[in-house]
């Protein structure tokens, strides 16, 4: 079976000891209060039973307190994401206490040993929180633990061991190896805090999944399906890194959870919304863009507290970089007849025209197949805010772009050489905006011309009934 490798380190064929020769290792956890936005500042070290540093370093007992918990490390140094997150928290919550949990000596080990150390580190954090609770005005409800990778499970242990209930735990792509399918007391779980929200960015159903696939929080958000993150493909990575490798892809996708969270802190005017759905395929079909009954939520720091009886899996698409927000649209296309479709699925593209901007040409992903005499649902998303939609251009691509489709066309031709022209009839397209929850119906410009065939296009304009609002709540979220 595949062996775990380093979420925050180098991709290795096998586990091995870090390059350090270990002498005089203290099994230690340090708590560094980041007292300045300057990342070079050494900060203040807090220790249980010593009240002086709390006073010297102006620890604010009534403010929010964030604990940032790193994960496994091959290098023994703090990864660069940590400083970004510290800075973003300081920017967003000026009075808050930001504490970095430094467990590098225990994380700079074999992955399996680091996993075994998570419990010890969780205990240390719980002890610190228990001690802080003895102080006047300090409230556990104001504590927000933010754990990346292995650090997410450390946060889970801390929440489990502390006397009382921590306000919130955010798991940023919690580690998968040795935690997938584990008992709830041996991993991050919803009972570890009053609110547990999780971002999954590197899950794989084949091979080794660096991030945990299973839902482990009250809400589990899977950006881009939780696996392939835009801007993290080998081509993207090779573009920015001369000697880019699969390792860089792993790091990019795994770390994307941190950047999504940072984005939610610094770009609060551009919140990204996720939508509840049973699985990624259904989301890709555009079925799940509802905000009724708490079915949508802001992601990252701005997430609304939801304590569902059942775990809530949520999905969204994102851009390749900050700000990550995109605008989701559900497109319902009723195909009322088609001719000579043969074996191959058509390749459709849409262009959306709005009051603010026009979209690029967007592909309609056919998840299964086009059904006739049925409503086919698609998900499209744009990087820019188009405003109110005015018209839609639907294009059926002519020449096949894939070898598979070419082969199917060739087979179709062999079995039916005089295959008359393929044709599809569409009268209207219903569009729903995920972000505004508004619904609109578009009709063909010419009611007599509803047919579309390969290499042709069909134009749709807003039908006379205009915008239809269906008593649905907009995903606008009160910011914390």
């Amino acid at each position: 079976s595949p062996v775990p490798f380093g979420p925050e380190g180098r991709l290795e064929d096998k586990l091995h000891k870090p390059k350090a020769t270990q002498t005089e290792v203290k099994p230690s956890v340090r708590f560094n209060l980041r007292t300045s936005k300057d990342p070079e500042h050494e900060g203040c070290y807090l220790s249980v039973g010593h009240s002086q540093p709390l006073e010297d370093c102006s620890f604010n007992m009534t403010a929010k307190t964030f604990f940032i918990i790193h994960g496994w490390t091959m290098s023994g140094i703090f990864e660069n994401w940590l400083h970004k997150l510290v800075s973003a928290l300081h920017t967003r919550e000026k009075d808050a206490n930001v504490v970095v949990v430094d467990w590098l000596p225990l994380a700079h080990q074999l992955y399996t040993d680091a996993v075994n150390n998570t419990r010890v580190v969780g205990h240390s954090i719980a002890r610190m929180l228990d001690w802080l609770q003895e102080k006047d005005d300090f409230s556990l409800g104001n504590v927000h633990l933010i754990g990346y990778s292995l650090g997410a499970h450390v946060a889970g242990y801390a929440g489990n061991f502390v006397k009382g209930t921590v306000g919130r735990i955010t798991g940023l792509d919690p580690a998968g190896p040795m935690f997938e399918g584990a008992d709830i007391h041996k991993r991050l779980s919803p009972d570890d805090a009053d609110f547990v929200d999780v971002l999954h960015t590197y899950t794989r159903s084949f091979g080794l999944s660096i991030g945990i696939q299973m839902p482990v929080g009250h809400i589990d958000i899977y950006p881009n399906g939780g696996d392939f993150q835009p801007g993290c493909g080998l081509n993207d990575v090779l573009g920015s890194i001369a000697y880019g490798t699969i390792t860089e892809v792993v790091k990019c996708e795994h770390e994307r959870a941190v950047h999504l969270f940072v984005d939610s802190l610094v770009n609060q005017d551009k919140p990204s919304f996720a939508f509840q759905c049973t699985d990624s395929n259904r989301f890709k079909k555009g079925i799940c863009l509802s905000c009724r009954k708490n079915r949508c939520n802001s992601i990252g720091y701005n997430a609304k507290k939801m304590r569902n009886k059942r775990n809530s899996k949520m999905y969204l698409k994102t851009r390749a970089g900050m700000p990550f927000r995109v605008y989701h649209y559900q497109m319902k296309i009723h195909v009322f007849s088609y001719k000579n479709m043969g074996e191959i699925e058509p390749t459709f593209y849409v262009t959306l025209y709005g009051t603010n901007a026009d979209s690029q040409t967007l592909p309609l992903e056919i998840v299964e197949r086009i059904e006739q005499n049925a409503t086919n649902t698609f998900l499209v998303y744009t990087e820019e805010d188009l405003g109110d939609l005015l018209k839609i251009q639907l294009t059926w691509e002519g020449a096949s772009q894939s070898w598979y489709n070419l082969w199917k066309e060739f087979r179709s031709y062999l079995s039916q050489p005089r295959n008359p022209g393929r044709e599809l009839n569409i009268r209207r397209i219903r569009v729903k905006s995920g972000e505004t929850q508004r619904k609109l119906t578009f009709c063909t410009e010419d009611p007599e011309n509803t047919s579309i065939s390969p290499g042709r296009e069909l134009w749709f304009r807003k039908c006379r009934d205009g915008w239809r609002m269906k008593n649905e709540t907009s995903p606008t979220v009160e910011l914390p």
Epitope: A20, T21, Q22, T23, E24, V25, K26, S28, R30, N32, R34, D38, P39, E40, H41, E42, G43, Y45, S75, G76, I77, F78, N80, L82, H83, K84, V86, V100, D102, L104, P105, H108, S240, I241, A242, Y243, G244, H259
Partner: antibody
Framework: QVQLVQSGSELKKPGASVKVSCKAS????????LNWVRQAPGQGLEWMGW????????TYAGDFKGRFVFSLDTSVSTAYLQISSLKAEDTAVYYC?????????????WGKGTTVTVSS | DIVLTQSPASLAVSPGQRATITCKAS??????????MHWYQQKPGQPPKLLIY???NLASGVPARFSGSGSGTDFTLTINPVEANDTANYYC?????????FGGGTKVEIK
């Protein structure tokens, strides 16, 4: 003020060992990592590795595994570099330099350097 | 490991003139908006001294005649105007990941 004071020059024979010290003052020793940098005569700067002054965990660069050992005595805020089985090519100035655990980890404070000469 | 290539290897400048040294990295040393590129000055018989950190920030006590710029893989150290006591070797360094690496150095001489 913040400073790193290194031990004096050493003249050693091939095969011998040497231990260079670096004493920190003016700051909390365990709050910064301690790096070792080698500069051979007329050459550039070469990072040898570093030691986490809190945990005592050393990390060695590829060319410095084996004969080189980093150690600490936190009670006297001192880091040590020991080189065993000295060779002529170990002749160089050895610098200790401080870097933060946080931020961009540049080397903001340097010792004056210890010249180690290996000659028969 | 990231390789840093400095140019020119040596440079002779008259006092009052501008000296420009470049450093090219084999891969990007940027993380988000931060550049993990730094510059050091080493005078004969002395240890290196931090001049510029994070591509463009002047280290404490360094005169404003020194400035740094660049991002990604291409960085520049500028001394303007050059003074007689600027005779030294200048090194760039990256710390985006371990091992931190140094450029080969540029020897600046004052005419």
């Amino acid at each position: 003020q913040v400073q790193l004071v290194q031990s004096g020059s050493e003249l050693k024979k091939p095969g011998a060992s040497v231990k260079v010290s670096c004493k920190a003052s003016g700051y909390t020793f365990t709050n910064y990592g301690l790096n070792w940098v080698r500069q051979a005569p007329g050459q550039g700067l070469e990072w040898m590795g570093w030691i986490n002054t809190y945990s005592g965990v050393p990390t060695y660069a590829g060319d410095f595994k084996g004969r080189f050992v980093f150690s600490l005595d936190t009670s006297v805020s001192t880091a040590y570099l020991q080189i065993s089985s000295l060779k002529a090519e170990d002749t160089a100035v050895y610098y200790c330099a401080r870097r933060g655990y946080y931020g961009r980890r540049f080397f903001d404070v340097w010792g004056k350097g210890t010249t180690v000469t290996v000659s028969s | 490991d990231i390789v840093l290539t400095q140019s020119p290897a040596s440079l002779a400048v008259s006092p009052g003139q501008r000296a420009t040294i470049t450093c090219k990295a084999s891969q990007s040393v940027d993380y988000d908006v931060d550049s993990y590129m730094h510059w050091y000055q080493q005078k004969p018989g002395q240890p290196p001294k931090l001049l510029i950190y994070a591509a463009s920030n002047l280290a404490s006590g360094v005169p404003a005649r020194f400035s740094g710029s660049g991002s990604g893989t291409d960085f520049t150290l500028t001394i303007n105007p050059v003074e007689a006591n600027d005779t030294a070797n200048y090194y760039c360094q990256n710390t985006i990941e371990d091992p931190p690496t140094f450029g080969g150095g540029t020897k600046v001489e004052i005419k």
